[in-house]
Interface confidence: medium
């Protein structure tokens, strides 16, 4: 049992979960909805869950619905990375995963989505109104960031109502092309949804083991231009922020710690290990449509005995940044 913040809670049907007819009738609304919501721009969804059994444990799941190749995912809390947020994890498709306390496990769920389990106690423990942000970079198209949080009133074990659309920060100025076809699609969608209201929805039983299990996703359009949608970043209860973060920046140091942009994130304490991550299953939901992960089996191993992640003597030197050629 868990509390979830979905933004809003919409579930696109997954293959194999319904009969062909039901599947076909349900797919169209979701396709149209995605069109209506994204309006031609890539999209990041964020889902935050609090485990009922461990109140200090959170699971953050994020995904990218654009067509570019994902090159780097940064998960932060306390606001967007680069706007006061503290970096919790960085996931690179080739160079591996790095995470900092209180992040316990970061991993690729599919080739376009990630999950991060957080746990902690006291000052480093997340709390219900903490904002979690995910930033997906795709070079050279741009980078997109969305944020989400649990409603402060959420009771563990109860399904949380959908929260408002997540805070978005699309750093790529995109095109908000709303065509007549799109408008028609949106109107048609509303018509379908009204009709669908009067029919009982089939209950889907999520499987805890299958990567194809139904997943409530937070859907929201990426902001095409920062000027186009002025949504203030959420403020968080500072008591939920890590209390022992060192912000000093020793210049010129060779370590990756010294390379964290201080304006973007506090430097987390403690050792950070590269996490071993499984290659996403071929059957998993994939929204990246091109080269980088064309064959899941070709992704290089992230870690392992004898694998030097950073043969460059200077090593990777900062937390943020894109890559992923179309």
């Amino acid at each position: 049992m868990r509390t979830e913040a979905q933004v809003p809670a919409l579930q696109p049907p997954e293959p194999g979960l319904e009969g062909a007819m039901g599947h076909r009738t349900l797919v169209l609304p979701w396709v149209l909805l995605t069109l209506c919501v994204t309006a031609g721009t890539p999209e990041v969804w964020v889902q935050v869950r609090m485990e009922a059994t461990e109140l200090s444990s959170f699971t953050i799941r994020c995904g990218f619905l654009g067509s570019g190749s994902i090159s780097l995912v940064t998960v932060s809390w306390g606001g967007p990375n680069g706007a006061g947020g503290t970096t919790l994890a960085v996931l690179h498709p080739e160079r591996g995963i790095r995470q900092w306390a209180p992040a316990r496990q970061a991993r690729w769920e599919t080739q376009s989505s990630i999950s991060l389990i957080l746990e902690g106690s006291g000052a480093s423990s997340p709390c219900a109104n903490t904002t979690f942000c995910c930033k997906f970079a795709s070079f050279p198209e741009g980078s997109w960031e969305a944020c989400g949080s649990l409603p402060p009133s959420s009771d563990p074990g109860l399904s949380a109502p959908p929260t408002p659309a997540p805070i978005l920060r699309a750093d790529l100025a995109g095109i908000l092309g709303v065509s007549g076809v799109l408008l028609f699609g949106c109107v048609y969608l509303l018509h379908l949804l009204r009709r669908h209201k009067h029919r009982p929805a089939p209950r889907l039983q999520p499987s805890r083991t299958s990567p194809q299990a139904p997943r409530a996703r937070a859907w929201a359009p990426s902001q095409a231009s920062q000027a186009a949608l002025h949504v203030p970043y959420a403020t968080i209860n500072t008591s939920c922020r890590p209390a022992t973060l060192d912000t000093a920046h020793p210049h010129g140091g060779p370590s990756w710690w010294a390379s964290l942009p201080t304006h973007a994130a506090h430097r987390p304490q403690g050792p950070a290990a590269w996490a071993s991550t499984p290659i996403p299953a071929r059957g998993s939901f994939v929204s990246v449509e091109n080269g980088l992960y064309a064959q899941a089996g070709e992704r290089p191993p992230h870690t392992g005995p004898g694998l030097t992640l950073f043969p460059d003597p200077r090593g990777p030197r900062a937390m943020e940044g894109p890559l992923g050629v179309r």
Epitope: L72, E94, A137, P140, L292, A318, E320, G324, V325
Partner: antibody, heavy 120, light 106 residues
Framework: EVQLQQSGPELVKPGASVKISCKAS????????KNWVKQSHGKSLEWIGA????????SYNQKFKGKATLTVDKSSSTVYMELRSLTSEDSAVYYC?????????????WGQGTTLTVSS | QIVLSQSPALLSASPGEKVTMTCRAN?????MHWYQQKPGSSPKPWIY???NLASGVPARFSGSGSGTSFSLTISRVEAEDAATYYC?????????FGAGTKLELK
Amino acid sequence: EVQLQQSGPELVKPGASVKISCKASGYTFTHYYKNWVKQSHGKSLEWIGAINPNIGGPSYNQKFKGKATLTVDKSSSTVYMELRSLTSEDSAVYYCARSDDYGGYYFDYWGQGTTLTVSS
Amino acid sequence: QIVLSQSPALLSASPGEKVTMTCRANSSVNYMHWYQQKPGSSPKPWIYATSNLASGVPARFSGSGSGTSFSLTISRVEAEDAATYYCQQWTSNPLTFGAGTKLELK
């Protein structure tokens, strides 16, 4: 030690094509993007495009589409840039540079540059 | 595309002086990077991700800024700092550079 070794200077006639190379060493070639940057005499820098050795599909600055073609040979850890239909405007120093995505996508290592002169 | 405007184009300073050069973008960017280039040489990474000094860069250099306005500051200029400094962004395609600020010593 990370090194990007570029091919030597080129003198070519207008209308011709040229292919310049950049051989990488000292790091895992496939982990980084390779970029090409143009610097006309006494002028600023212009990003031409980038290629990821693991994908092969390059990405271009729209301005250079049709002018530059980027390719990669993973077996020799070399990236190439072919410039075609050359004019005097293409005379410049061309740099290959490795990008560091963790650094906010900046160029952490540069080749020594290849001088291209287009003249009849 | 995002256009970066550097000012001043030419900066003349005496050794020991504090100097600041700016880079303005016509649209908000994530980070700004800075490169130093001396005549006949390749550009060198100087400051990355707005405020981080690249390897080997003296601590007298610093970078700051956010959104559309960024700056590179040298607390006490030395003779070896004479060079052209370029800013660079990658927030949207294409990646772009500023026209450069040439720092010369009096």
